[in-house]
């Protein structure tokens, strides 16, 4: 995608496919032909790794091989030889260089003295045509150190310790075509240092400490085609014609410097420049006429700079441009007509740019565009005429579906059904468990309501996935910015937070009663209701604050298709990031730690009291039941929250987290608690089991009575629900004695154990 990649990857070339260009088959907007057959397929099915056409046509020519590589591959064919183990072409010809240092290798007229601890340029026969002195200890290049090598064509000096180069160091190298000085410590190049290098075509000075260059630096380089100054410390380019002494310069690579701005005169003499790479600099300002002289420019790479504003007509003279990279710039706004003049553009990279005013009008004039790259795959909908649009998924959604994975599309319904049904069932069953402990029941119903919201959230996501099925991309941007998405996202957070806070509250109540039985004060109705109200209010506040301040939180819930703010992106506002961390690694992590600690302490406390009990075997059995129950409560909490904490923590450390993680977390991990809470806190408890048992017993009785024609009297289910203090000695079963689990503290220590089975 970038020009630099030409250096490191051998490109595969092919014909380029532009919308409708040169094809007999005409397809409607957003559709592209399957080669020479009449079938047309939508954008999202082209270049997706699947043979949808049936003749591979939709997967042909998908590589983005635009840019200089197409025209100038011949200049790079030998670059790869240089990076191989030996820079020699023939297999193993005999050495034709008369005198060769013992530690060097020689084949034909080419000499390889790599990694031989040389401290100076060796003296060899003058007929040498290539000399590789890489990875040595050369510190300086004195005058005339290459004077006799009139036939030398390639000189490799990478990875030495060169700090100074004499102005006459390269004198006599009249045949030199390629000079590599990368990975040294060069701070300055004296004007005229390259004066004798009239045939030099490549000059590569990557990874040095050059802080300034001026036109006279390159005096004598009339044949230079490629100049690579990557990864130096250049802060500015001269306000004079840079290419004054390099009239044939085609490729200028200034990636990874510290250049702040580009001046109007810099490129005035660079009329033959075909590729200009300026990525990873600190460019913050561009003048309207900066690129005006570059009328032959084929590739312009300005990615990863600090550009905030693009002058409206900055690209107006770049009629030949086929590849433009503006990725990862803090560009505030792109003009609707910004790209109008780029009629030959084939590849446009806008990754990492939030295009708030995105519209089809921006890309419509780019009729030859075959590849486009955005920050969000949702933007692809605004360039329907471009065959290859990336990204085509954010890991959650794809161009076709809100939920990219078929597993997720199915399970969103399964999990939401289980969650809703389980919780509604418990809510409905509560009146039948006529507990004296109304306050505890109220807390459980509250928990079920919160968990039910998670089921509703998943139902809504599933519903919109169905609604957008097959054409999600058309609606993606609008959906993520919609009120529906904001509300459904806040519903998920409300559910999560209320559930977490309620579980913490219930756990702390039990903890105090079990661990400090004699300090246990019976919580009044008023206090319990107050706590429940406070928990719900807190949940609402946490969930709805991001909706109240768009400026601060941006589109907090709409960062992905499932509207759940799990991990922050780099471009998300700092406020949103802090807020998200405060929820997940603040409130929720603290709650999780409290729950784990409380259950651990409770079990320890019960275990300690059980040691004094006499019926050892019975106690061990009960202890195991208790341990099992506690383990499942803590385990499901851990199962739900540990992955979320890990994801959040990693995103905080700026570890790249695949988008797929969010959807799997939302559909399979986040609802674990919501789905299992009714089972853990109600459906598996003894009161519930007994109630079911009595229902069943009563039903059987009634049947047998009916068959005998007798009237049935159902027993009233009046018993004390004290989950998790369920097993009571009959003599203590008095309604007035237990109105809350706390009061169990009056029971002897050994009885405490019974109460948890």
């Amino acid at each position: 995608m970038t020009s630099g990649s030409v250096f490191f990857y051998i490109l595969i070339f092919g014909k380029y496919f532009s919308h409708g260009g040169g094809q007999d088959v005409k397809c409607s907007l957003g559709y592209f032909p399957c080669g020479n057959i009449t079938k047309c397929l939508p954008q999202l099915l082209h270049c997706n790794g699947v043979d949808d056409c049936g003749n591979q046509a939709d997967e042909d020519n998908c590589g983005d091989n635009n840019g200089w590589s197409l025209q100038f591959d011949k200049y790079f064919a030998s670059y790869y030889k240089m990076t191989s183990q030996y820079p020699f072409e023939a297999e193993t010809p005999e050495c034709l260089v008369g005198s060769v240092p013992v530690q060097c290798l020689c084949q034909g007229l080419e000499l390889d003295c790599d990694e031989t601890n040389l401290r100076a340029v060796p003296s060899v026969s003058s007929n040498v045509t290539a000399m590789s002195l890489q990875w040595n200890l050369i510190r300086k290049l004195p005058p005339d150190c290459f004077k006799n090598y009139h036939d030398l064509q390639k000189l490799y000096l990478q990875n030495n310790k060169i700090t100074s180069i004499s102005i006459y160091a390269f004198r006599g190298l009249n045949s030199l075509t390629k000079l590599y000085l990368s990975h040294n410590r060069i701070t300055f190049l004296k004007p005229g240092v390259f004066e004798d290098l009239h045939r030099l075509e490549w000059l590569i000075i990557e990874d040095n400490h050059l802080s300034r260059i001026s036109p006279p630096t390159f005096y004598g380089l009339n044949s230079l085609i490629l100049l690579v100054l990557m990864n130096n410390v250049l802060t500015r380019l001269p306000d004079k014609p840079l290419c004054q002494h390099m009239p044939r310069l085609h490729w200028l690579d200034l990636e990874g410097n510290h250049i702040h701005n580009l001046r109007n005169l810099t490129f005035i003499s660079c009329s033959n420049l075909t590729v200009l790479v300026m990525r990873k600099n600190k460019i913050n300002h561009l003048n309207e006429n900066t690129f005006a002289p570059l009328q032959k420019l084929d590739e312009l790479d300005l990615g990863s700079n600090k550009i905030e504003n693009l002058p409206p007509l900055i690209f107006k003279d770049l009629k030949e441009l086929s590849q433009l990279n503006l990725s990862y710039n803090p560009i505030q706004k792109i003009q609707a007509n910004q790209f109008d003049y780029l009629v030959k553009l084939k590849s446009l990279s806008l990754e990492g740019i939030e295009i708030s005013n995105i519209q089809q009008r921006m890309f419509r004039p780019l009729m030859n565009l075959s590849h486009i790259y955005f920050k969000k795959f949702q933007y692809c909908g605004y360039a329907p005429h471009v065959r290859s649009c990336k990204p085509n998924t954010d890991g959650i959604s794809s161009l076709e579906n809100l939920l990219a994975s078929i597993i997720q599309r199915v399970f969103v319904w399964v999990v939401s059904a289980v969650t809703c049904f389980g919780n509604i069932f418990v809510i409905c069953m509560r009146p039948y468990i006529r507990s004296e402990n109304k306050l505890y029941a109220m807390s459980i119903i509250s928990l079920c309501c919160a968990d039910c919201l998670m089921g509703i959230y998943l139902f809504v996501i599933g519903g919109f996935d169905l609604k957008f099925r097959g054409e999600y991309n058309k609606h993606a941007q609008l959906w993520m910015e919609s009120t529906h998405c904001q509300l459904v996202g806040s519903l998920a957070i409300l559910s999560t937070e209320v559930s977490v806070l309620l579980l913490t509250f219930l756990t702390l109540e039990k903890y105090i009663c079990i661990v400090y039985p004699f300090r246990c004060v019976r919580p009044g109705k008023c206090r319990t209701i107050t706590v429940l109200i406070l928990i719900w209010i807190t949940g609402f506040i946490v969930a709805f604050i991001p909706l109240s301040n768009k400026e601060f939180f941006k589109n907090y819930y709409g960062t992905n298709g499932v509207c759940f703010p799990l991990h922050s992106e780099d471009t998300e506002s700092i406020g949103a990031q802090i807020y998200s961390v405060a929820i997940f690694l603040g409130i929720n992590l603290a709650a999780f730690i409290i729950i784990v600690f409380s259950y651990g302490s409770m079990f320890y406390s019960v275990h300690q009291s059980a040691i004094t009990a006499t019926e050892i075997r019975n106690q061990v059995k009960k202890e195991m039941i208790l341990a099992k129950r506690f383990f499942f409560i803590v385990f499901t909490d851990a199962l739900c929250w540990i992955p979320i904490f890990v994801v959040k923590f990693l995103s905080l450390l700026q570890v790249e987290i695949p988008g797929t993680i969010t959807s799997w977390v939302v559909i399979f991990i986040l609802p674990i608690n919501s789905a299992l809470n009714p089972i853990l806190y109600t459906l598996t408890t003894r009161p519930f089991k007994e109630m079911i048992h009595r229902f069943w017993y009563n039903y059987r009785q009634r049947k047998s009575m009916d068959s005998k024609g007798q009237k049935t009297y159902a027993p009233s289910f009046i018993w004390v629900e004290m989950w998790p203090l369920q097993e009571m000695p009959p003599e203590l079963m008095k309604p007035d004695l237990f109105t809350y689990p706390c009061e169990m503290s009056l029971i002897s220590q050994s009885t405490r154990l019974n109460s948890y089975s």
Partner: antibody, heavy 121, light 107 residues
């Protein structure tokens, strides 16, 4: 233990070609940064370097015999070969093969016991 | 080509004597000089490499010195088994060259 063993004809006629073999045992001839040399010593005279082949296959010859000599190798058999064309009585000598670490100044650390050649009509 | 000149073809010595053999290079070879010992009917043996480094197993009575163009090989106390021909060799650049040899014999 590294051993080098030269073999070849004892007597050949002038103008014929000489073929010598050096079998290396206990060490790979393709080991990085090692070269394998042929050196000869005419009766009662000093040592003369004839040429070398290095680990990656590069070959170097003494200018005095360059036009009529060829060094080659068989990496699978771990053998070094030396061929000298159009021999004369001047080529009567003891022929040695030796190993050299490809670092300036290290010299020839292992030698074969040598093979004697007499050129006679 | 670099020419290595050993000024003495023969050197007479007695057991226990100190003897020095010199070698001169026609151009700068830094310290890339090796010394060999050859006894009648045997292959040469490496004694000294890189001008002054003793090869493994070589007795410490054998020493070498020098750099640039002038090199010296010394036997601090000659033993009867040291009677042999000694060659210097430049191991700096191809073609590799030897000195003509110095024969050490008893007085």
């Amino acid at each position: 233990q590294i051993q080098l063993k030269e073999s070849g004809p004892v007597v050949i006629k002038p103008s014929q070609s000489l073929s010598l073999t050096c079998i290396v045992s206990g060490f790979s001839i393709t080991s990085s940064r090692f070269c394998w040399n042929w050196i000869r010593q005419p009766p009662g005279k000093g040592l003369e370097w004839m040429g070398r082949i290095c680990y990656e296959g590069s070959r170097y010859y003494s200018p005095s015999i360059k036009s009529r000599s060829t060094i080659s190798r068989d990496t699978s058999l771990n053998k070094i070969f030396f061929q000298l064309n159009s021999v004369t009585s001047e080529d009567t000598a003891m022929y040695y093969c030796s190993r050299e670490k490809q670092i300036a100044g290290t010299g020839f650390d292992y030698w074969g016991q040598g093979t004697t050649l007499t050129v006679s009509s | 080509d670099i020419v290595m000149t050993q000024s003495h073809k023969f050197m007479s010595t007695s057991v226990g004597d100190r003897v020095s053999i010199t070698c001169k290079a026609s151009q700068d070879v830094s310290t890339a000089v090796a010394w060999y010992q050859q006894k009648p009917g045997q292959s040469p043996k490496l004694l000294i490499y890189s001008s002054s480094y003793r090869y493994t197993g070589v007795p410490d009575r054998f020493t070498g010195s020098g750099s640039g163009t002038d090199f010296t090989f010394t036997i601090s106390s000659v033993q009867s088994e040291d009677l042999a021909v000694y060659y210097c060799q430049q191991h700096y650049s191809t073609p590799l060259t030897f000195g003509a040899g110095t024969k050490l014999e008893l007085k």
